[in-house]
């Protein structure tokens, strides 16, 4: 089992050190600062999930040096930056979704002896994320269907 | 296979400044999210932790006793260091260093999953 | 800094009998807690991390739960073997802590 961290209060103070190994953010219907970034040294485990998120402000993350896994899953992500996607060693947790390719192309270029990526589709089951790509975001799909959720085709 | 043997000098005199060193094999503390830890345990008593140092030389101490310690590494010599100054009686103490692993399938976890046999020290004059 | 108090400081059973180990956090650590064994004249061994989950190789006997403040180390059936201390351990917040130990003796 995946470890977990009590949720942190609505009222999420961005100025403030956390110095916490795990916060969860979830649920919370936060916006994230695009100009100030996250002041938690000790974080490894992040959880985001739930709240909305069209895109992670990279500047948010620039400071976690120490993270490991970003859980970004039931957001309706547009984009991921690729700074974000570079970081070879982080393990993001996202719903299955077209906007992932730039985060899947970049790990595939920059990134030597990586585990396959994965995806979440809405019945929490995880799925190659490769192989999601290729059925549900070619490119006539994906001009047709945006970078809105798929489901996974069998 | 993951080993970390520590060493120190087994008696150190009151006031004196204690030196240990942790010489690992089995994995890199070059790898991402690796990190070493020192641990006390005097007698009878639990465990303390005290120090901890992370692959990118960031390092972490215990409140406690941070103004004593400094922990180091040699990367390219497999050994992690922990200095600790003006010792007194209380200093007694089996040292260990245990590895924190990264755990690429189920991020997120903190632990101690390998640790060393230990070094007694004692401080007597 | 997080307490880790653990219950009892020390307890004899017999060996085939269940076992209940308790640790109680001073705050809300989540899973961040690990259990490690701890033989007479021996470093501790790691058995049980984020509460739950057993380390490689140790036995399914050894059942960790909880989350929170309140945490379980079971021995289904104690066995000799397991003669021991116990310490549970938060890796929440730093600086790391870990309680006193639990000393599984012989009845």
């Known amino acids: 089992l995946e470890p977990s961290c009590t949720v942190s209060s609505a009222d999420v103070d961005w100025n403030a050190e956390f110095s916490a190994t795990c916060l969860n953010f979830s649920g919370l219907s936060l916006s994230l600062p695009h100009n100030q970034s996250l002041r938690a040294s000790n974080v490894i485990l992040l959880d985001l999930s739930g709240n909305g998120l069209r895109e992670l402000p990279v500047t948010f993350f620039a400071h976690l040096q120490k993270l490991e896994v970003l859980n970004v899953l039931r957001n309706p992500l547009s984009r991921v930056d690729g700074a974000l996607a570079a970081r070879c060693d982080l393990d993001l947790q996202a719903d299955c979704n077209c906007a992932l390719e730039s985060w899947h192309d970049i790990r595939r270029d920059n990134c030597s002896g990586q585990k396959p990526l994965l995806c979440w589709d809405t019945t929490s089951s995880q799925h190659n994320l490769s192989a999601f790509l290729e059925v549900s975001c070619a490119p006539g799909l994906a001009s047709a269907t945006g970078s809105g959720h798929h489901h996974h085709h069998h | 296979q993951v080993t970390l043997k520590e060493s120190g000098p087994g008696t150190v005199q009151p006031s004196q400044t204690l030196s240990l060193t942790c010489s690992f094999s089995g994995f890199s503390l070059s790898t991402s999210g690796m990190g070493v830890s020192w641990i006390r345990q005097s007698s009878g008593k639990g465990l303390e932790w005290l120090a901890h140092?992370?692959?990118?030389?960031?390092?972490r101490y215990n409140p406690s006793l941070k103004s004593r310690l400094t922990i180091s590494k040699d990367t390219s010599s497999n050994q992690v260091f922990l200095r600790i100054t003006s010792v007194d009686t209380a200093d007694t103490a089996t040292y260990y260093c245990a590895r924190r692993p990264r755990d690429f399938y189920g991020g997120g976890h903190w632990y101690f999953d390998v640790w060393g046999a230990g070094t007694t020290v004692t401080v007597s004059s | 800094d997080v307490v880790m108090t653990q219950t009892p400081k020390s307890m004899s059973m017999s060996v085939g009998e269940r076992v209940t180990l308790n640790c109680k956090a001073s705050?809300?650590?989540?899973?961040?807690v690990s259990w490690y064994q701890q033989k007479p004249e021996q470093s501790p061994k790691l058995l049980i991390y984020?509460?739950?989950n057993r380390y490689t190789g140790v036995p399914d006997r050894f059942t960790g739960s909880g989350s929170a403040t309140d945490f379980t180390l079971t021995i289904s059936s104690m066995q000799a073997e397991d003669l021991a201390d116990y310490h549970c351990?938060?890796?929440?917040?730093?600086?790391?802590?870990f309680g006193a130990g639990t000393k599984l003796e012989l009845k």
């Open positions: 705050e809300n650590v989540g899973t961040y």
């Open positions: 140092i992370y692959w990118d030389d960031d390092k």
């Open positions: 984020g509460a739950s």
């Open positions: 351990g938060q890796s929440y917040n730093f600086p790391l802590t």
